[in-house]
């Protein structure tokens, strides 16, 4: 049977041989592999200006394997695709394209943004923060005694940092004035230890200066988000005032 295949091909290609290298079923000196052994994939390999047929157990990058009855071949991925699973599903795009649902796009669709590291279209992630922690004890110059008017602080954590197009994070620290019944400091009492919760260090990229306090200090360039945050903070303070009217600590 092989001899007959060789005989038939010999008319077309001089030097056809069944004694082929690397998985060829039939081959020629000029063309390399003409056909492959079962389960191997045929691919044209460019060597300078020449194309040589080779048989591989899996397809090279930029190709995917197509299997038909008794004939397998490596088929090129689409022009904008570097690695693909099949004709319609890319897994890595060429430079300058973004991967989205197996397709390579110039720009990401609305509602998604380009991740320039993975070169994929990803969901826009908005900032997420936790609920406020309780207010700290009323302090003045680090003491919890020997004064009537001081400040108290509360913090919240960033649960999810925003992506490039996501909404910015609101402030994570709030400070307000507080009034307490003056209490004499005991000898050697600084009033800090064991009474004040350790304050969380500001998150990377956050500065202490950016922490708004109840005086409502504004930065010279205020974004719409910051303006909205301040309005929300004011609302919260009014609510807190109403809730705390029973307690000793009051907001000025």
């Amino acid at each position: 049977q092989n001899a007959s295949r060789g005989r038939r091909q010999r008319r077309m290609h001089p030097n056809v041989s069944q004694g082929c290298q690397g998985g060829c079923a039939t081959c020629s000196d000029y063309n390399g592999c003409l056909s492959c052994k079962p389960r191997l994939f045929f691919v044209l390999e460019r060597i300078g200006m020449k194309q040589i047929g080779v048989c591989l157990s899996s397809c090279p990058s930029g190709y995917y394997g197509t299997r038909y009855p008794d004939i397998n071949k490596c088929t090129k991925c689409k022009a904008d695709c570097d690695t693909c699973f099949n004709k319609n599903f890319c897994t890595k795009c060429k430079s300058g394209f973004y991967l989205h649902l197996g397709k390579c796009l110039d720009n990401c669709p609305e509602g998604l943004e380009a991740n320039n590291h993975t070169m994929e279209c990803v969901n826009i992630v908005h900032c997420e923060v936790s609920e406020w922690n309780p207010w700290s004890p009323c302090t003045k110059k680090g003491k919890t005694c020997g004064f009537k008017r001081g400040t108290e602080t509360r913090v919240r954590e960033i649960m999810q940092h925003p992506s490039a197009k996501g909404n910015l994070c609101p402030p994570t620290n709030e400070t307000r004035k507080c009034t307490v019944q003056r209490k004499k400091c005991q000898k050697g009492e600084r009033g800090k230890k064991g009474r004040e919760r350790k304050r969380k260090k500001p998150n990377k990229g956050e500065s202490k200066e950016a922490i708004p306090d109840s005086k409502g200090l504004e930065s010279s360039k205020e974004t719409p988000e910051q303006r909205e945050n301040k309005q929300q903070q004011k609302k919260r303070k009014v609510q807190d005032k109403q809730q705390k009217s029973v307690s000793v600590s009051t907001v000025h």
């Epitope: 295949r5 077309m12 063309n31 592999c33 056909s35 044209l44 047929g53 009855p69 004939i71």
Partner: antibody
Framework: EVQLQESGPSLVKPSQTLSLTCSVT????????WSWIRKFPGNKLEFMGY???????YYIPSLKSRVSITRDTSKNQYYLQLNSVTTEDTATYYC?????????????WGQGTLVTVSS | DIKMTQSPSSMYASLGERVTITCKAS??????LSWFQQKPGKSPKTLIY???RLIDGVPSRFSGSGSGQDYSLTINSLEYEDMGIYYC?????????FGAGTRLEIK
């Protein structure tokens, strides 16, 4: 020299089955891929499918439900059956062969047989 | 299916003239393209395969070129026996598909 020769009825009635034989000499149908191709009036060529050296078949999606390619290795022949024919199946039917992606496709053809579908 | 758009659909050319027939695939076919010639009452005859490889016995005035989606067949100096219908075929992907043909006639 590889030769392919089609044979079968030249007239088939609508709704009936078209049956053709391709007789091969100079090569064995247990190597390579053995195809059927048809040429419609107006010169459009259509590949219909193939049977491989091991007897596996491939049919084009548009004909899959009504086409069958079989073979008889002892006679070195392969066959085409096309069911439920209509006048749209009137064409010249060719058998042809190829031996893989690195060689010429359809290097050898039969001379063709004209099949008319008419009542 | 991959669509092969062949042009022109028909043409007249003079003996000795250089003739070019083109085929455009609906997607990249990676050089898996053949050209056939069919004369009246005869079966198609393979001229070229894998874009530019000439079949043994085909005159050297025939040549093929192209890549990606665009391919062409050139007859360098037309002879009388070259008249007929020329078809391109893509076999990059099943089902393999033919162009609609170019009828070449002598002026």
């Amino acid at each position: 020299e590889v030769q392919l020769q089609e044979s079968g009825p030249s007239l088939v009635k609508p709704s009936q089955t078209l049956s053709l034989t391709c007789s091969v000499t100079g090569d064995s149908i247990t190597s390579g891929y053995w195809s059927w191709i048809r040429k419609f009036p107006g010169n459009k060529l259509e590949f219909m499918g193939y049977i491989s050296f091991s007897g596996k078949t491939y049919y084009i999606p548009s004909l899959k439900s009504r086409v069958s390619i079989t073979r008889d290795t002892s006679k070195n022949q392969y066959y085409l059956q096309l069911n439920s024919v209509t006048t749209e199946d009137t064409a010249t039917y060719y058998c042809a062969t190829y031996h893989g992606y690195g060689g010429p496709w359809f290097a050898y053809w039969g001379q063709g047989t004209l099949v008319t579908v008419s009542s | 299916d991959i669509k092969m758009t062949q042009s022109p659909s028909s043409m007249y050319a003079s003996l000795g003239e250089r003739v070019t027939i083109t085929c455009k695939a609906s997607q990249d076919i990676d050089s898996y393209l053949s050209w056939f010639q069919q004369k009246p009452g005869k079966s198609p005859k393979t001229l070229i395969y894998l874009t530019n490889r000439l079949i043994d016995g085909v005159p050297s005035r025939f040549s093929g070129s192209g890549s990606g989606q665009d391919y062409s067949l050139t007859i360098n100096s037309l002879e009388y026996e070259d008249m007929g219908i020329y078809y391109c075929l893509q076999y990059d992907e099943f089902p393999v598909t033919f162009g609609a043909g170019t009828r070449l006639e002598i002026k």
